[in-house]
């Protein structure tokens, strides 16, 4: 009997309101044993996949998707989905990314705190595990 897959959660660092030209990282979380995380934009037709997974906590794994320099066209709704063999999960709730004109430049601390959507709260990082800073812009052929 196949297990019921929990819905993933999605959050954004440093927040969901990002000054033009600043960076944002979407963090998708799911259970242990996820093979692929997918970040979807607005609809299923625009997405980015990664198989580079972190052990986020004893019961969770995660993946990170980073936009290095946010443009107005990046504003919109994002959600996560994952593949844990042999099936895909349901989608997370949508997270809305807002892009605003920046008066203080890319390092201006005027973003909202990290926001998450989904059924689970993000637990603290487990000290055993590697959590490297992310730096990838989302794939042009998919999410721009």
């Amino acid at each position: 009997q196949e297990e019921d897959l929990p819905r993933p959660s999605i959050s954004a660092e440093p927040g969901t309101v990002i000054p033009l030209g600043s960076h944002v990282t979407f963090v998708c979380r799911g259970p242990v044993g996820v093979q692929t995380f997918r970040l979807e934009r607005d609809s299923r037709s625009t997405y980015n996949d990664t198989e580079d997974v972190s052990q986020a906590s004893p019961s969770e794994s995660e993946a990170r998707f980073r936009i290095d320099s946010v443009r107005e066209g990046n504003a919109g709704l994002y959600r996560c989905i994952y593949y844990k063999p042999p099936k895909w999960s349901e989608q997370s709730d949508y997270l809305e990314l807002l892009v605003k004109e920046s008066s203080g430049g890319p390092d201006s601390p005027d973003t909202e705190p990290g926001s998450s959507a989904g059924p689970t709260q993000r637990p603290s990082d487990n000290s055993h595990n590697e959590h490297a800073p992310a730096s990838q812009g989302l794939k042009a052929e998919h999410l721009y």
Partner: antibody, heavy 120, light 107 residues
């Protein structure tokens, strides 16, 4: 079918250097973390190094036995993985495998390996 | 570093036997445990990940179980092609570590 083909092994003197290469094909290389794992003759498996993807800043991790001597790197545009090995000792004699990461640390596809012998 | 101890370095077995190989971690690895099969002259092959999940193409006579520090690989009815060395590996934390291996030999 996923393919990982290692090259660059050979005979090298102690304190010498060698650079191993791994050509990856038939999968989206830039979305996977990658590893090097080695196996000394007649011995078990030893994890050597791991490199993550650009989305995780190409973060690298090493076994204590190779830290500060070996460097793992990648070229996503060419789907290539590398291992630069410096200050080699006889303890580094082994078959070196290029391996694809799965599930955040498990290893699902392995190359056939390239042999490194360190001897004077 | 997390140490991985396998039950025995070698087993003498008969075809058709049920075989159980155990692996014990020095601390809880939260089911981040993989099993590999290696035949002489070949690269290892991933059999099981996340302690219990059988990889595609692996025969159903193989199964994995366990949690916490203690894990088991079982082969229900040993076939000729199963004669190999089996390794466990933890991927809860770096440095990733393998067990010493368990070699199956035919009696």
């Amino acid at each position: 079918e996923v393919q990982l083909v290692e090259s660059g092994g050979g005979l090298v003197q102690p304190k010498g250097s060698l650079k191993l290469s791994c050509a990856a094909s038939d999968f989206t290389f830039n979305t996977y973390a990658m590893h090097w794992v080695r196996q000394a003759p007649g011995k078990g498996l030893e994890w050597v190094a791991r490199i993550r993807t650009k989305s995780n800043n190409y973060a690298t991790y090493y076994a204590d036995s190779v830290k500060d001597r070996f460097t793992i790197s990648r070229d996503d545009s060419q789907s290539m993985l590398y291992l630069q090995m410096n200050n080699l000792t006889t303890e580094d004699t082994a078959m070196y495998y290029c391996v694809r990461d799965r599930y955040g640390g498990a290893m699902d596809y392995w190359g056939q390996g390239t042999s490194v012998t360190v001897s004077s | 570093d997390i140490q991985m101890a396998q039950s025995s370095s070698s087993f003498s077995v008969s075809l058709g036997d049920r075989v159980t190989i155990t692996c014990k971690a020095s601390e809880d690895i939260y089911i981040r445990l993989a099993w590999y099969q290696q035949k002489p002259g070949n690269a290892p092959r991933l059999l099981i990940s996340t302690a219990t999940s059988l990889e595609t193409g692996v025969p159903s006579r193989f199964s994995g179980s366990g949690s916490g520090k203690d894990y088991t690989l079982s082969i229900t009815s040993l076939q000729t092609e199963d004669v190999a060395t089996y390794y466990c590996q933890q991927y809860w934390s770096t440095p990733y570590t393998f067990g010493g291996g368990t070699r199956l030999e035919i009696k």
